[in-house]
Amino acid sequence: PTDAPVSPTTLYVEDISEPPLHDFYCSRLLDLVFLLDGSSRLSEAEFEVLKAFVVDMMERLRISQKWVRVAVVEYHDGSHAYIGLKDRKRPSELRRIASQVKYAGSQVASTSEVLKYTLFQIFSKIDRPEASRITLLLMASQEPQRMSRNFVRYVQGLKKKKVIVIPVGIGPHANLKQIRLIEKQAPENKAFVLSSVDELEQQRDEIVSYLCDLAPEAPPPTLPPDMAQVTVGPGLLGVSTLGPKRNSMVL
């Protein structure tokens, strides 16, 4: 489960810089949710490779509350959140937590339930409207039909909240019907269908590039209106305030 909210006295360390680990490094405004299939359709070893992929992706993102925020959820018949979007931890600590997600190996992994959880828990309030919202649905199994009655409704609900859903089908048991339904809902909902977890590493750069391209770059930093900046012009010293409609004063 995710930690309790940070108290005002908590030291905020997640912006203490950790150098990029790779040449490609996504510095965009993005809220990214990883949903990991916890069914027995993946063996424990395959699930370890799935987690390695998530950690690999996280290494290529500029994770912080200002740039890329991440959530990590393992789903079976319910959902287990390991990292929340608002968790204020160092990127290395978040990667460590992701690598320790427990293998459930359950009979069922309900995509409907986890999309419902994403819609009503993770994106219940949109607190960063300027950021793109993307859910990476890593799926290797098929939920029973009785569980999927509201599947389309949840996908449409996510679309209304401008949440892009990118399904990644893994192996022979992934629910291709649901993947196609997700793709139909929005042009950005691009699917990746892989024959096994071994292909995750080969597709990783393409997937992370696709996600990154969907997110906006941060606007250039602006100084607050009341902040004065001393400027030296040709032959005169001026003080210009960067606020709107303010004239420079000549000293």
Epitope: E46, V49, D56, G171, S196, V197, D198
Partner: nanobody, 116 residues
Framework: AVQLVESGGGLVQPGGSLKLSCATS????????MAWYRQASGKQRELVAT???????SYADSVKGRFTISRDNAKNTVYLQMNSLKPEDTAVYDC??????????WGQGTQVTVSS
């Protein structure tokens, strides 16, 4: 069919070390995640360590900090360096492909016995 040949097991005292090797003849090796498993007498086979094609590793809690998995793609071989061995590490150790569809038939494995 792809074959896997494990070696390097033996009898070792508690606190000792062994390095296991697992060689395969497959062209698919370099693009495949590999894993070491072990099975103690009368118990189920358990996952010990995995390594992806890119070299990212993971370990069972019981061996973290003591065992190291590695691979040499040029030699189509995966290794398991085992340090600070304990009597509870006694088992038959097997390696195999992680992905079910690629999995080779389970071989004889290599016996590791930790005893004083």
């Amino acid at each position: 069919a792809v074959q896997l040949v494990e070696s390097g097991g033996g009898l070792v005292q508690p606190g000792g070390s062994l390095k296991l090797s697992c060689a395969t003849s497959g062209s698919i090796f370099s693009s495949s995640a590999m894993a070491w498993y072990r099975q103690a007498s009368g118990k189920q086979r358990e996952l010990v360590a995995t390594i992806t094609s890119g070299g990212r590793t993971s370990y069972a809690d019981s061996v973290k900090g003591r065992f190291t998995i590695s691979r040499d793609n040029a030699k189509n071989t995966v290794y398991l360096q085992m340090n600070s061995l304990k009597p509870e590490d006694t088992a038959v150790y097997d390696c195999n492909f992680v992905v079910d569809g690629k999995r080779a038939p389970w071989g004889q494995g290599t016996q590791v016995t930790v005893s004083s």
